[in-house]
């Protein structure tokens, strides 16, 4: 009975040709969306001239179809039981799940004006940026149409900077035919207790972004779990997204299509300043817009995007200190909506629906030689837009997976 | 102790091209940018131009555009002034000064420009 | 191009007295204004950066004020050691621009 089934299950969640497990992990049979919502700035010259609170609007949901493309280059390594791959990116637009097109037009902070200072803090070399953001007619907010703003668009700023730099800009540039990786992943074979557990990352088993265990990289990629998950645990897991590991706790059971699954949530904590969680403090890597790391909820990720002040949260600033959202109007955080789950099967370990909910933030920062942000009288961080990636197991998966494992069980 | 050496005095004929250098020491090369600064005999002081040396980019002034080349070797922490097409009007004292979040805060000694036939 | 107008040319003062030096520009640069320090032989020393801030290590009888367009340089109490030639340096707009520069004399 109990026996059989462990053993059957042990068998088909290692990542092997021929397991389940490994047909679902290379190309996942879930449809998954990533949807979007565009902070749209409604003061732009209020705010660049008087340094007003910002007000935004939010817009959206504009969907796209991820994570649709297969893993490639899958190597198995029988000396160390791991698989290497790397998961390619692609992004398809659906506009009957969409409120417009991708040629809406939104006023958003201008990305490159915002991040010049900040990447090039020398005085000589802001006073050549000023004159050339002057000249290129640029200023603190622009106005971009949803596929640039995502995908990339030629900076009429940085295209005239006299030595080489890239000058496209997008909140994901590049992502169409870019991958993700090399990771490298326990396969199970020896160890079920490790499988989908990432062993490296780009070819390093740490991050290079965080000083001391904040940049470990542990757990698996959230796709899936080793089997039999308890309530107690704890979820480790790697989001290359916001360049860091981080972890779920058990907040409920449901019932998804018939099958049992624990819902796991990211808790609050997770966001919390070194003051309210010691074990953050790594998190906090600069000292002036973190108030002295006492801010919390919003994710410096600079280290990982060449130095551009990105800001990592959660949506609407949910869970994130009331200094942070202060300048910004406009904002309504709601735990349902805003928050990061994972519905996992318990007996495999598999995640059969999850949300994933993240906003990217750009940071602005007065700076005296640069005239489109010398009238700003405090630092921003700057909603850009939110994103909600959502996956669940199809019906006739659902069916199958109750056949396979949960029926059999019962 | 921050410091910036520059080459010594030069006797070119008009026509000529001579390349003036400014080895930095003591402190981070790319940290600060690099300017060079023009004196004429009994006269002000002209800006030509600076120099970013993490990425060797630069700006002139318009009339110094194609008479400097400024150029950089991070690997020796030096600054490098080329002028070309001499004529009188190029004799001057030439320096190199650093610049960080203060507008030149350290001048090299000068180099000294002599072009005469 | 952003204009320096400094004046006077040349200035001749008692030991003691207060000397004033002024920059006008032609266009607003805030208070990104400098002033040097030269001496014969020697190449320009900053006195005072932009924001009217005294560099470390110069005596507190050099001040400056202004905004705008309008700056000026003041000796408190001048000594002998203070005879030397003086620049106002605009650094707010390219290309950066100096004064023509005011020689001190002692009278």
């Known amino acids: 009975g109990d026996m059989l089934i462990e053993k059957t299950i042990k068998r088909e969640v290692v990542l092997e040709e021929g397991t389940t497990a490994f047909k679902n992990w290379v190309k996942t049979g879930t449809t998954v969306y990533r949807q979007f919502w565009i902070f749209d700035v409604q003061n732009p010259d209020d705010v660049a001239k008087n340094s007003s609170k910002i007000k935004v609007k939010q817009r959206g949901p504009y969907t796209y179809r991820v994570r649709y493309l297969a893993k490639e280059n899958i190597t198995q390594d029988p000396e160390d039981h791991t698989v290497s791959f790397v998961q390619p990116n692609g992004a398809i637009f659906e506009p009957s799940l969409s409120v417009g097109t991708e040629d809406d037009n939104f006023t958003v902070l201008n990305l490159a004006v915002a991040a010049a200072p900040h990447i090039y803090q020398n005085s000589f070399v802001q006073v050549v940026l000023n004159s050339l953001i002057k000249k290129s007619k640029s200023s603190m907010f622009q106005t971009r149409s949803l596929k640039e703003l995502l995908w990339g668009y030629k900076d009429p700023f940085l295209s005239l900077v006299p030595y080489p730099i890239s000058t496209t800009v997008g909140v994901f540039y590049p992502y169409n035919d870019t991958v993700d990786g090399v990771y490298k992943v326990f396969n199970g074979k020896d160890n079920i207790s490790k499988v989908a557990i990432i062993e490296s990352y780009k070819g390093k088993r740490n991050l290079s972004y965080w000083p001391s265990y904040c940049d470990m990289i542990n757990g698996t990629d959230a796709a899936s779990f080793p089997p039999f998950v308890e309530k107690s645990r704890t979820l480790r897991f790697f989001s290359s997204d916001i360049c860091r590991s981080i972890y779920a706790v058990f907040g409920s059971e449901i019932d998804l299509k018939g099958i049992p699954v624990y819902r796991f949530v990211l808790p609050a904590n997770a966001f919390a300043s070194p003051l309210q969680n010691p074990d953050n403090h790594c998190f906090c890597t600069e000292k002036v817009i973190s108030n002295n790391c006492t801010s919390y909820g919003v994710l410096d990720i600079g280290k990982c995007k060449e130095g551009k002040p990105v800001y990592i949260s959660l949506p609407h600033f949910l869970h994130a200190s009331p200094d942070v959202s202060e300048p910004i109007e406009g904002l309504h955080p709601n735990e349902d909506e805003h928050r990061t789950y994972l519905d996992v099967e318990p007996i495999t370990g598999f995640t059969l629906q999850f949300a994933k909910r993240l906003q990217v933030n750009i940071l602005v920062k007065p700076a005296r030689k640069i005239e489109a942000l010398k009238n700003l009288k405090r630092p921003y961080i700057v909603p850009i837009l939110w994103l909600n990636e959502t996956g669940t197991i199809g019906d006739e998966k659902a069916e199958m997976f109750k056949t396979q494992v949960t029926g059999k069980i019962k | 102790e921050v410091q910036l050496q520059q080459s010594g005095p030069e006797l070119v004929k008009p026509g000529a091209s001579v390349k003036i250098s400014c080895k930095t020491s003591?402190?981070?090369?790319?940290?600060?940018?690099i300017h060079w600064v023009k004196q004429s005999h009994g006269k002000s002081l002209e800006w030509i131009g600076g120099?970013?040396?993490?990425?060797?980019?630069?700006s002139h002034k318009q009339n110094f555009k194609d008479k400097a080349t400024l150029t950089v070797d991070k690997s020796s922490s030096t600054a490098y002034m080329e002028l070309r097409s001499l004529t009188s009007e190029d004799s001057a004292v030439y320096y190199c000064?650093?610049?960080?979040?203060?507008?030149?805060?350290?001048w090299g000694q000068g180099t000294t420009l002599t072009v005469s036939s | 191009e952003t204009t320096v107008t400094q004046s006077p040319a040349s200035l001749s003062m008692a030991i003691g007295e207060k000397v004033t030096i002024r920059c006008i520009t032609s266009?607003?640069?805030?208070?990104?204004m400098n002033w040097y320090q030269q001496k014969p032989g020697e190449p320009p020393k900053l006195l005072i950066s932009?924001?009217?801030t005294l560099r470390p290590g110069v005596p507190s009888r050099f001040s400056s004020s202004g905004y705008g367009t309008d700056f000026v340089f003041t000796i408190e109490n001048m000594l002998s050691e203070d005879v030397a030639d003086y620049y106002c340096?605009?650094?707010?707009?390219?290309?950066?621009?100096f004064g023509s520069g005011t020689k001190l004399e002692i009278k």
């Open positions: 000064a650093r610049a960080g979040d203060y507008a030149f805060d350290y």
């Open positions: 003591g402190y981070t090369f790319t940290e600060y940018t």
């Open positions: 120099i970013i040396p993490n990425n060797g980019g630069s």
């Open positions: 266009t607003d640069i805030d208070d990104d």
């Open positions: 932009e924001g009217n």
């Open positions: 340096l605009q650094s707010g707009t390219l290309p950066f621009t």
